[in-house]
Amino acid sequence: TQNKALPENVKYGIVLDAGSSHTSLYIYKWPAEKENDTGVVHQVEECRVKGPGISKFVQKVNEIGIYLTDCMERAREVIPRSQHQETPVYLGATAGMRLLRMESEELADRVLDVVERSLSNYPFDFQGARIITGQEEGAYGWITINYLLGKFSQKTRWFSIVPYETNNQETFGALDLGGASTQVTFVPQNQTIESPDNALQFRLYGKDYNVYTHSFLCYGKDQALWQKLAKDIQVASNEILRDPCFHPGYKKVVNVSDLYKTPCTKRFEMTLPFQQFEIQGIGNYQQCHQSILELFNTSYCPYSQCAFNGIFLPPLQGDFGAFSAFYFVMKFLNLTSEKVSQEKVTEMMKKFCAQPWEEIKTSYAGVKEKYLSEYCFSGTYILSLLLQGYHFTADSWEHIHFIGKIQGSDAGWTLGYMLNLTNMIPAEQPLSTPLSHSTYV
């Protein structure tokens, strides 16, 4: 007789990451009876919503439902119908919406209200949409990567089941780069966290963690570029901006009104004698790097040491996972290998930025020109942020691991967020249960 497979006793969860440049929907799955075990939740699907981030819909909020449809439909297809009503859906909005809220709380609320109404129409258990804080974004990213790396598990293994595992319980730091903000989160070594705003205390699986975190609003790659342009146009003699962060031969017209639309450029705003200016790329890494460094104020620090802009940063400790745009940009530039030294990365960036725009366009025909044109800036920015901003060195560079996925799940804040909201990370170590047959490999 044919063995009939028993119905899987599994649960699902959905988290939407409403970022500044796009929205992604993640579907997670786990065995129902192992909710409190570490490492059992895994991602089964990512659906990237086609289009921009939700903050761009501020003038046409009635269309947010249309925008979200395809990925929500995908979730309906992936998750068995019998599970729909008990599958929680969470939406967390990050720095793009934080910036919109700074401009107008009313507009931000209107966007979130329409998001909530749209998501409530689906057959899932919608749990709400909110703007998460930068501190949460950092903390949940840290939880995600350490959960996936098995750092919260008390069982020591003689073999490694995940990449980067050093077979110890020392947690990884988390480096997250978005379009509008960037987060740094790690456990410092026996160091007091001098600023209370940057201190987090967790008890996870029976162990206490004192975690440092900071989110730099306006220092995501897209907002950093707007800042740089606003800073540089101040000293341009006319409406031509010769920019070392773009490839030679690249040209783009920018509206001054667009430049000053974001709160991130307010500190550089001035009355200009023109409504538009033209970026003309000259492709020079060194000059680009110098220009970026001017965005980091390192002249003032009220603590024993700072990152930049007077923000406390303890001495770096241990290994770090660098994900989101840190990974996407470095992956595009083919610089994610563990073997590539910081000197080699700098060398490669010099060559890449110097390549003529026409040559770049031909080499990367399938890449959207807006994104393609910005890789020189983004790569240079990543180096500047990590080296001068966070004080990594040529030696400590090897402790940075550019990570896209761990065990098939994307590195990012969404998994940590869901684990927290579904109470799947216990404070105490769960009582160990006898191994079931399925535990044996």
């Epitope: 289009g51 761009k56 439902g65 249309i66 925008y67 449809t69 890449v367 020109e369 807006k370």
Partner: antibody, heavy 121, light 111 residues
Framework: QVQLKQSGAELVKPGASVKLSCTAS????????VHWVKQRPEQGLEWIGK????????KFDPKFQGKATITADTSSNTAYLQLSSLTSEDTAVYYC??????????????WGQGTTLTVSS | NIVLTQSPASLAVSLGQRATISCRAS??????????MNWFQQKPGQPPKLLIY???NQGSGVPARFSGSGSGTDFSLNIHPLEEDDTAMYFC?????????FGGGTKLELK
């Protein structure tokens, strides 16, 4: 600036197969869905199917299942429509189309110029 | 499959007047609070062009004289005031569920 360039007209014999292409410039096909639409001479429009080039998920009108295959190559920014076991009923103009939201939340649509397929012995 | 029936099959309207084209679906094309009905214009020898998406939203660069309305099973496209350039075929399309289907088309001519 965005253009969809479709391959040239095809004259093929019944029973044969053909592969039509649609190449985008100034836009990444990964950022939207690519749809294929059939229009027979002096007739209306028929939706064949669509592909999400980012993850190669495809959806078809069941009527074209087995007849049409939609694929995409993101490195060359090209989508393909392969039609098999051709008959005179497949004689038509085939359009590729992209529609969706751009970076500023404007809803766009881009269409190829159409490829004329003639099936005749 | 959802069947879309357009009426009239052809229509002649004077310059400056209002042209109204109807589209009826065999079942509701509403879902999640959205009406998944689109309207396209096609001129001879050219590909179609999106005019209206989700029943009432104007496509990029579409003149304000084109408007769409309706929900559930009954939809209409209005053109007012009619211009010479508007003579074309007009198609409705539902995108609520696969297979997406088109109406049979309405030929709009100048009177």
């Amino acid at each position: 600036q965005v253009q969809l360039k479709q391959s040239g007209a095809e004259l093929v014999k019944p029973g044969a197969s053909v592969k039509l292409s649609c190449t985008a410039s100034g836009f990444s096909i990964k950022d939207t869905y690519v749809h294929w639409v059939k229009q027979r001479p002096e007739q209306g429009l028929e939706w064949i199917g669509k592909i999400d080039p980012a993850n190669v998920n495809t959806k078809f009108d069941p009527k074209f299942q087995g007849k049409a295959t939609i694929t995409a190559d993101t490195s060359s920014n090209t989508a393909y429509l392969q039609l098999s076991s051709l008959t005179s009923e497949d004689t038509a103009v085939y359009y590729c189309a992209l529609y969706g939201y751009d970076d500023d939340a404007y809803y766009f649509d881009y269409w190829g110029q159409g490829t004329t397929l003639t099936v005749s012995s | 499959n959802i069947v879309l029936t357009q009426s009239p099959a052809s229509l002649a309207v004077s310059l400056g007047q209002r042209a109204t084209i109807s589209c009826r679906a065999s079942e509701s094309v509403d879902n999640y609070g959205i009406s998944f009905m689109n309207w396209f214009q096609q001129k001879p020898g050219q590909p179609p062009k999106l005019l209206i998406y989700a029943a009432s939203n104007q496509g990029s660069g579409v003149p304000a004289r084109f408007s769409g309305s309706g929900s559930g099973t009954d939809f209409s496209l209005n053109i007012h005031p009619l211009e010479e350039d508007d003579t074309a075929m007009y198609f409705c399309q539902q995108s609520k569920e696969v297979p997406y289907t088109f109406g049979g088309g309405t030929k709009l001519e100048l009177k």
